[in-house]
């Protein structure tokens, strides 16, 4: 689709006459009419196949043509055509003599005619003029003309359809050519696709307009370069979305269990030495004079049981006082004004004679101790039962009473869950720390490899000389349907070959 | 914002064990950072702290009731308890349970539970 | 262990009378691990003060906390009526971490 522009530039009839020779009174009031037609090699008259057009009375005898308008005309003259330029046409321009105001061919005069030309040739679309003059005995127009496309239409003959866009459909301009020219930040045949925010991801990221980069699942960070580790994993790194590959020092299906807390956390105080003991766990080994899980409390100076002999400790200011029993006297009534003939031994111990009488010393029974065997011995002073475990004083031993969970002597052990051997059909176990894992051999699965998945006995091809294989999905096994002349659970040997037995 | 609450039973008789639980929420339980405590207040006197357990399972417990007292951690259901066994008409009182967080300044308590001890 | 002597054991003032309450240790005690408690009837206990000396979090700025290793004092610079309760100290320097007996502050 285009248009054949024709601009009239000037026409000279100095005598005034018409192609008869006559003169017109009182002057020639002259008009065009154009005949656009396909290539004839000899322009005949016929049908105007690529268009007409008329204009109104331009002027008189001699005149030039003004651009654009005269007498509610045109100029230059508009011949659209609907069609793929070919490239050749045939042009036929005649000059009119308009006696009164009615320009129609039935009324006028034939003899009305002044003037006509006819050319015809090739002519590419483009946008510059083409100047021509054509002289006859009595008349000389002077005119220039083109082809051009109409909008949107683009090509050397005007046969590319482009329109420009920005929607959902496409984001392009249009070349001179008719080839489209993507906006800024568009690509692709029709400019549909956005080019993502530079370095995004080629895989894991994708955008849905320009400068974008969305990341498909798994992926995160402004390029989609960075994987999405495990839901949950706390001290952990992936390579591939979902992953938790724990940092030293951690340990666990989310990397959240850890393995070197004093490290991690230093919560030991007042000097104390701390030990790892496991999943997150931890010991505090307190300095002298300290207490408690963390080593944080001080021990009051009469916790430590200076006064000896039954005396009794009075917490003070600036230490302690030893409030000593009769008989004892010293710091820590460490002195003894008794002897054995004062029975100085409580819950049957045995007095000894010391320094020839000057002292004595008791030798105590099995669960009493002190210097007068006074005291009841406490097995659980030490606090020897590990993870939470109650220590209980059961006469001259002592016992531990362990939370779930835990066994041996001091609660030390982790039952593991795996110790009852769940995981069924030869299922390895794995003991968590919230319960068991069975990873399940070929042909089994379930939490505990209960249920058995069937194996295709057959996938192996364990059947030779083109035999036919069949599973028994009974027992996972296969069997061989021999052809004749094969033998053998595996159809493997030839018949009257017998196999070579070593007896 | 982390709550504590106690609950069980508000009457044991003598000689049975006392057990009350104290749950947590809020996000602080998994911290290795707390002592989490039980405290106890007599009918009209002053508080006693009994023991605390830290989310690793360790304990400490006052001498005075050492022999008597247990305190467990489920880390599962963000909750830790108290067993005192062989109660006596002594042990009733208010029980609190108490966070303590890297020293033992209470900031967060339970609002209390009563038990008594009576057959 | 250590006891904490709180006195006086109860204190009749008045609103906007300026309260001091005092708190010693029968040995010594860092005054670091030193902390005050306010309980209303029926209620858990509040802390108000630790380290001897630290405003607990949503305290008003007129309690204050002050010590050496055996004495201690809580200061309120001006009664408001809902600071009449009982006020305890604790020490958590020494084992077995221990409570004072209380002083009641009441309005006169």
């Known amino acids: 689709s285009g248009v054949f522009q024709l601009q009239l530039q000037e026409f000279i009839n100095e005598r005034g006459v018409l192609a008869s020779g006559r003169p017109c009174e009182p002057g020639c009031r002259t008009f065009f009419r154009v005949c656009l037609k396909h290539f004839q090699a000899v322009v005949s008259p016929g049908p105007c196949t690529f268009g007409t057009v008329s204009t109104p009375v331009l002027g008189t005898n001699s005149f030039a043509v003004r651009d654009d308008s005269s007498g509610g005309g045109r100029n230059p003259l508009q011949l659209p055509f609907n069609f793929t330029w070919p490239g050749t046409f045939s042009l036929i321009i005649e000059a009119w003599h308009a006696p009164g105001d009615d320009l129609r061919p039935e009324a006028l005069p034939p003899d009305a005619l002044i003037s006509k030309i006819a050319i015809q040739g090739s002519l590419a679309v483009g946008q510059n003029w083409l100047l021509d003059e054509q002289t006859s005995t009595l008349t000389r127009l002077r005119y220039s003309y083109r082809v051009i496309c109409s909008d949107n239409y683009y090509g050397d003959n005007c046969s590319r359809l482009c329109k420009k866009r920005n929607d959902h459909f496409g984001h392009y301009v249009c070349q001179p050519d008719g080839n489209l020219s993507c906006l800024p930040g568009w690509t692709g045949e029709y400019c549909q696709q956005p080019i993502c925010l530079s370095g995004c991801h080629e895989q894991n990221g994708y955008c849905s307009k320009p400068a974008e980069c969305l990341c498909r699942p798994g992926w995160q960070g402004r390029l989609c370069n960075e994987c999405i580790p495990h839901n949950g994993c706390r001290h952990g790194t992936c390579s591939t979305p979902w992953q938790c590959t724990c940092d030293e020092g951690w340990g666990g299906l989310f990397c959240d269990q850890d393995l070197n807390y004093c490290t991690h956390h230093s919560p030991c105080k007042n000097g104390a030495t701390c030990s790892n003991s496991g999943q997150r766990s931890y010991t505090c080994t307190c300095r002298p004079g300290y207490t408690g899980v963390d080593c944080e409390l001080e021990l009051s100076e009469c916790d430590s049981n200076p006064c000896r002999n039954g005396g009794s400790c009075k917490d003070q200011e600036d230490g302690y006082h030893c409030l000593c029993p009769p008989g004892y006297y010293g710091l820590h009534c460490e002195h003894s004004t008794l002897s054995c003939a004062d029975s100085p031994c409580f819950n049957g111990g045995s007095c000894r004679e010391r320094n020839q009488g000057a002292n004595y010393a008791c030798e105590c029974p099995p669960n009493f101790t002190g210097s007068n065997c006074e005291k009841k011995v406490d097995r659980c002073t030490s606090n020897p039962c590990a993870n939470g475990g109650q220590c209980l004083n059961r006469g001259p031993s002592r016992m531990c009473r362990c939370r779930p969970g835990f066994t041996g002597t001091y609660c030390e052990l982790h039952v593991s869950d795996c110790a009852r051997n769940p995981c069924a059909h030869g299922g390895t176990c794995h003991d968590l720390e919230n319960g068991l894992m069975c990873t399940c051999p070929a042909g089994f699965s379930g939490r505990r490899c209960e249920v058995r998945t069937s194996i295709d006995a057959c996938a192996s091809s364990p059947c030779f000389n083109r035999a036919t294989c069949y599973t028994d999905l009974s027992t996972d096994t296969f069997v061989c349907n021999c052809p004749y002349g094969f033998v053998g659970s595996r159809c493997e040997f030839p018949v009257g070959l017998p196999p070579s037995f070593p007896w | 914002q982390i709550t504590l609450k106690e609950s069980g039973p508000g009457l044991v008789k003598p000689s049975q064990t006392l057990s009350l639980t104290c749950a947590v929420s809020?996000?602080?339980?998994?911290?290795?950072?707390?002592?989490w405590s039980w405290i106890r207040q007599h009918p009209g006197k002053g508080l006693e702290w009994i023991g605390y357990?830290?989310?690793?399972?360790?304990?400490y417990y006052n001498p005075s009731l050492k022999s008597r007292v247990i305190i467990l951690v489920d880390t599962s259901k963000t909750q830790f308890s108290l067993k005192l066994s062989s109660v006596n008409a002594a042990d009733t009182a208010v029980y609190y349970c108490?966070?303590?967080?890297?020293?033992?300044?209470?900031?967060?308590w339970g609002q209390g539970t009563m038990v008594t001890v009576s057959s | 262990e250590t006891t904490l002597t709180q006195s006086p054991g109860t204190l009749s003032l008045f609103p906007g009378e300026r309260a001091t309450l005092s708190c010693r240790a029968s040995?010594?005690?860092?005054?670091?691990?030193l902390a005050w408690y306010q309980q209303k009837p029926g209620q858990a206990p509040r802390l108000l003060i630790y380290?001897?000396?630290s405003r607990a979090t949503g305290i008003p700025d007129r309690f204050s906390g002050s010590g050496s290793v055996t004495d201690s004092t809580l200061t309120i610079s001006s009664l408001e009526p809902e600071d009449f309760a009982v006020y305890y100290c604790?020490?958590?320097?020494?084992?077995?971490?221990?409570f004072g007996q209380g002083t009641k502050l009441e309005i006169k």
């Open positions: 108490a966070r303590a967080p890297g020293t033992h300044a209470f900031d967060v």
């Open positions: 809020g996000d602080s339980f998994s911290s290795g950072n707390y002592y």
């Open positions: 357990i830290k989310y690793t399972g360790s304990t």
């Open positions: 040995q010594s005690v860092s005054s670091s691990y």
């Open positions: 380290g001897a000396s």
């Open positions: 604790q020490q958590y320097s020494r084992s077995p971490i221990t």
